[in-house]
Amino acid sequence: MNGRVDYLVTEEEINLTRGPSGLGFNIVGGTDQQYVSNDSGIYVSRIKENGAAALDGRLQEGDKILSVNGQDLKNLLHQDAVDLFRNAGYAVSLRVQHRLQVQNGPIGHRGEGDPSG
């Protein structure tokens, strides 16, 4: 029998400077592209090697991005979220939610809706 899987959720403000090739990550999610069941939030799906996000080191695949330069990402269409990042300017402030899996008891399995899969 599997033990209970809990998640430690923390928030962090990450300030990135757009590099020569941009911010350097991919996103999934949005009201028209729900990635996690019952959650239309925006998640980081890929950090590009040697990009601004990778060099900074704090943003991780699976992180949920709550806001960009203070603008909430709730209830946005996927393409609108992409456009928001693309038009965010040179200095970009991200409010992100990290979700760290904490194992209690025997080894469990990651849930179907976990964005880090």
């Epitope: 990550f25 991919n26 996103i27 592209q33 990635y35 799906s45 992409v82 693309r86 179907e112």
Partner: nanobody
Framework: DVQLVESGGGLVQAGGSLRLSCVAS????????MGWFRQAPGKEREFVAH??????DYADSVKGRFTISRDNAKNTMYLQMNSLKPEDTAVYYC?????????????????????WGQGTQVTVS
């Protein structure tokens, strides 16, 4: 990981048509950004077509002849190739990136993609 399997290649006469398919594993297919590339003998791998969440794009050499599409319910991407020419002869590869880049997308750059299929041979005589 994502597995990609291409099919539909073959030998066709100039002016003919083929439809390539690329089946991708994974429950989040609809979040994939996808592309077709090709590589002729002795040449570099070159971009053919791309399909994102809300856009498509084509190499100039195939515009008006090739059409890229996807069926999210079947986890499949297609490349309909019409009016084929001998210079279209190559191994055709499908490629996938997870999600949409937040930067201006250089979708013709193979480095933008995370996963690649094994390829399917197209020969136009």
């Amino acid at each position: 990981d994502v597995q990609l399997v291409e099919s539909g290649g073959g030998l066709v006469q100039a002016g003919g048509s083929l439809r390539l398919s690329c089946v991708a594993s994974g429950r989040t297919f609809r979040t994939y950004t996808m592309g077709w590339f090709r590589q002729a003998p002795g040449k570099e791998r070159e971009f053919v077509a791309h399909i994102g969440w809300s856009s498509t794009d084509y190499a100039d050499s195939v515009k008006g002849r090739f059409t890229i599409s996807r069926d999210n319910a079947k986890n499949t991407m297609y490349l309909q190739m019409n009016s084929l020419k001998p210079e279209d002869t190559a191994v055709y590869y499908c490629a996938v990136a997870i999600g949409s880049p937040v930067d201006s997308y250089r979708h013709s750059d193979p480095l933008e993609y995370d996963y690649w299929g094994q390829g399917t041979q197209v020969t136009v005589s």
